[in-house]
Interface confidence: low
């Protein structure tokens, strides 16, 4: 999916109002210095591409993010503010309806969500130069 035509300010508002808090809740009990933020993005469409990948792609070490509250709110924001996004996600949504929520938060998941926090912060400051 090409995120170029999303309403970035509306997505930013959704992040600031709810998604950011859900990410913090997920990471509660983890030191903010525990993980280096290495995952990067160069502009807002690229940030959303990476955010989608880390949030919804199944991974070898962390498979349970898609059913987390921040993930469901992320999906809702993208569906509402990115034209045509929901159509591209129909198959994925049907798969998710079958999915059982994993009760275990693995360390790999914590690392992954830490990277997501970095991507979202970068998304909110698109004019900053890359380090």
């Amino acid at each position: 999916y090409d995120f170029t035509n999303c309403d970035f300010e509306k997505i930013k508002a959704a992040y600031l109002s709810t998604i950011s808090k859900d990410l913090i809740t997920y990471m509660s009990g983890t030191k903010s210095t525990e993980f280096n933020n290495t995952v990067s993005c160069s502009n807002r469409p690229h940030c959303l591409t990476e955010i989608q990948s880390l949030t919804f792609n199944p991974t070898a070490g962390c498979a349970s993010l898609a059913k987390e509250m921040f993930a469901m709110k992320t999906k809702a924001a993208l569906a509402i503010w990115c034209p045509g996004y929901s159509e591209t996600q129909i198959n994925a949504t049907q798969a998710m309806k079958k999915a059982r929520k994993s009760k275990v938060t693995t360390n790999k998941c914590l690392e992954q969500v830490s990277q997501l926090q970095g991507l979202w912060r970068r998304f909110n400051r698109p004019l900053l130069k890359q380090q």
């Epitope: 990067s40 070898a60 790999k108 990277q115």
Partner: antibody, heavy 121, light 112 residues
Framework: EVQLVESGGGLVQPGGSLRLSCAAS????????MTWVRQAPGKGLEWVSS????????YYADSVKGRFTISRDNAKNSLSLQMNSLRAEDTAVYYC??????????????WGQGVLVTVSS | DIVMTQTPLSLSVTPGEPASISCRSS???????????LHWYLQKPGQSPQLLIY???HRASGVPDRFSGSGSDTDFTLKISRVEAEDVGVYYC?????????FGGGTKVEIK
Amino acid sequence: EVQLVESGGGLVQPGGSLRLSCAASGFTFSNYDMTWVRQAPGKGLEWVSSITFASSYIYYADSVKGRFTISRDNAKNSLSLQMNSLRAEDTAVYYCTRGGGAYYGGSLDVWGQGVLVTVSS
Amino acid sequence: DIVMTQTPLSLSVTPGEPASISCRSSQSLLHSNEYTYLHWYLQKPGQSPQLLIYLVSHRASGVPDRFSGSGSDTDFTLKISRVEAEDVGVYYCEQTLQTPFTFGGGTKVEIK
């Protein structure tokens, strides 16, 4: 163009050391987990080691645990494999690959050309 | 460790004919998220392996639609609907459900 280029292979005596390097280009290196896979002459593929994008988690095959060390430098887009106490059975072509955890269920979607390591006296 | 077993060891196919390779795992590759962590690779003669299929049935970028993957739990199949000369090589399955990640022993496909 997405590319992985390995270097550092060669002939080494049993018990010796070698350091393999992998230079990545054409993609945001720090956004991907990386994996080393090897292939002994005329044999199949064997997973060696994986490292997550932030180096927070590292995994090794039992056959190399305690002898090999995987590392990465995201600032330099490079992956390394330090191989110590080498044995004849470590003789193989070593492939640097992208994946092993973060995308597409851990499948390895980009492979380098491979570098030959020969352990012999 | 999860053991991956491929059959047959080798396969000789007439161009235009179908081909099928089986891969069996010693335990289920189905995760509680409903994804199954089984992938297929092709190593052409003298080349590095390349990803063909990921997560059982998803074709990797640039892979022709004559390749398809299917299966579930512990039994998986790679099918080539019409074999072409460029399809020769060794096919490997791999599991990434848990470390150590493991590959099948490979199936060599050649043209008759």
